[in-house]
């Protein structure tokens, strides 16, 4: 048993039939010594008396809010949560496996630049009685500070018969050095509580590996005289790290016909302009990637040819 937060305890249980469970001793937070009784949740059944209560925790029916009373007055509450371990593996019932980039990916994180700011998100089908708490650090043995905000519901989607809820959190490394080579990874830890079930999820990454630039901005076309060619120009996204001479991007320019089956013409360039042939009803799209490190491409910025 360990304390998640003041008065909230997590009991770690091996989850199999007829498991012995864990013995837990609760102490009433009061200077009183006599006449103390204990109840669980909304029940008025007295479980025991005295300043301490010893219980055997085996299942969810044994978890919940334990309250000590004296003479009809509530003295204090303790909440017991359960963390299940089945076949040596901690349960992952609360979050959905996103399966990208690999199986057992519950947390996904992205950064728009090298400032030390990043966003993580996760999915669940649970809509109520759900709490998330996020902590992060750079390294784990001698951790350096990363500050995370509150996890918020960022999207709701219908997937077949189920509703899916996306939560996200923004974090910022306290003393980020954008130009420095990373040697220790960022660690992100998410505590999830659904009703009386506790689970924790972790992710470890280097900022350089989760970089995904915003799409190029101000995408414009300039027709070239007496030609089917156009000059496409764009700018670095505002959110990209500066100076651009050091934090450079490379770009992919694509001409796509109306039909997805039509052949795509692609041009790769380090410049912020390119000359392409603009076919009727086609569109021109540009995306960006870190020039010196193959992290994710940005989403496409697009304009119609006409």
């Amino acid at each position: 048993i360990w304390e998640l937060k003041k008065d909230v305890y997590v009991v770690e249980l091996d989850w199999y039939p007829d498991a012995p469970g864990e013995m837990v001793v609760l102490t009433c937070d009061t200077p009183e010594e006599d006449g103390i009784t204990w109840t669980l949740d909304q029940s008025s059944e007295v479980l025991g008396s005295g300043k301490t209560l010893t219980i055997q925790v085996k299942e969810f029916g044994d978890a919940g809010q334990y309250t000590c009373h004296k003479g009809g007055e509530v003295l204090s509450h303790s909440l017991l949560l359960l963390h299940k371990k089945e076949d040596g593996i901690w349960s992952t019932d609360i979050l959905k496996d996103q399966k990208e980039p690999k199986n057992k990916t519950f947390l996904r994180c992205e950064a728009k630049n090298y400032s030390g700011r990043f966003t993580c998100w996760w999915l669940t089908t649970i809509s109520t009685d759900l709490t998330f708490s996020v902590k992060s650090s750079r390294g784990s043995s001698d951790p350096q500070g990363v500050t995370c905000g509150a996890a918020t519901l960022s999207a709701e989607r219908v997937r077949g018969d189920n509703k899916e809820y996306e939560y996200s959190v923004e974090c910022q490394e306290d003393s980020a050095c954008p130009a420095a080579e990373e040697s220790l990874p960022i660690e992100v830890m998410v505590d999830a509580v659904h009703k009386l079930k506790y689970e924790n999820y972790t992710s470890s990454f280097f900022i350089r590996d989760i970089i995904k630039p915003d799409p190029p901005k101000n995408l414009q076309l300039k027709p070239l005289k007496n030609s089917r060619q156009v000059e496409v120009s764009w700018e670095y996204p505002d959110t990209w790290s500066t100076p651009h001479s050091y934090f450079s991007l490379t770009f992919c320019v694509q001409v796509q016909g109306k039909s997805k089956r039509e052949k795509k013409d692609r041009v790769f360039t380090d410049k912020t302009s390119a000359t392409v042939i603009c076919r009727k009803n086609a569109s021109i799209s540009v995306r960006a990637q870190d020039r010196y490190y193959s992290s994710s491409w940005s989403e496409w910025a697009s304009v119609p040819c006409s």
């Epitope: 937060k5 003041k6 008065d7 909230v8 809010q65 509530v74 003295l75 204090s76 509450h77 303790s78 909440l79 109520t128 009685d129 759900l130 709490t131 708490s133 905000g149 509150a150 996890a151 509580v193």
Partner: nanobody
């Protein structure tokens, strides 16, 4: 600097309703349990209701159970106290408090306090 600012107090007739709010700043709101206490003239400050940092976990004093509802909006960093079927004995200054404990009924369980908002129930 942590600030808790209560609002919504005022004069209300017995049997009526009122909602008081408490806006928090300077703390990670979702990590804190929030509570309402009240103090009537010449009386000690007493616990009214608490909402833990954990979803759906609330606690009420017997005197307000079934009449008052505490709720919180983590996106707005705000906690509310909806008071229905008000009685003259509910007249008091209502104080908002924030603390790291789960659900405490004692004032020592809360580190931060607001300045209070006055609710007067006339008969």
């Amino acid at each position: 600097e942590v600030q808790l600012v209560e609002s919504g107090g005022g004069l209300v007739q017995a049997g009526g309703s009122r909602r008081v709010s408490c806006a928090a700043s300077g703390l990670t709101f979702s990590d804190y349990s929030m509570a309402w206490f009240r103090q009537a003239p010449g009386k000690e400050r007493e616990f009214v209701a608490a909402h833990a940092w954990l979803a759906s976990r609330t606690d009420y004093a017997d005197s307000v159970k079934g009449r008052f509802t505490i709720s919180r909006d983590n996106a707005k960093n705000t906690v509310y106290l909806q008071m229905n079927s008000l009685k003259p004995e509910d007249t008091a200054a209502y104080y908002c408090a924030a603390g790291q404990r789960y659900l405490s009924r004692v004032s020592q369980g809360y580190e931060y306090w607001g300045q209070g908002t006055q609710v007067t129930v006339s008969s």
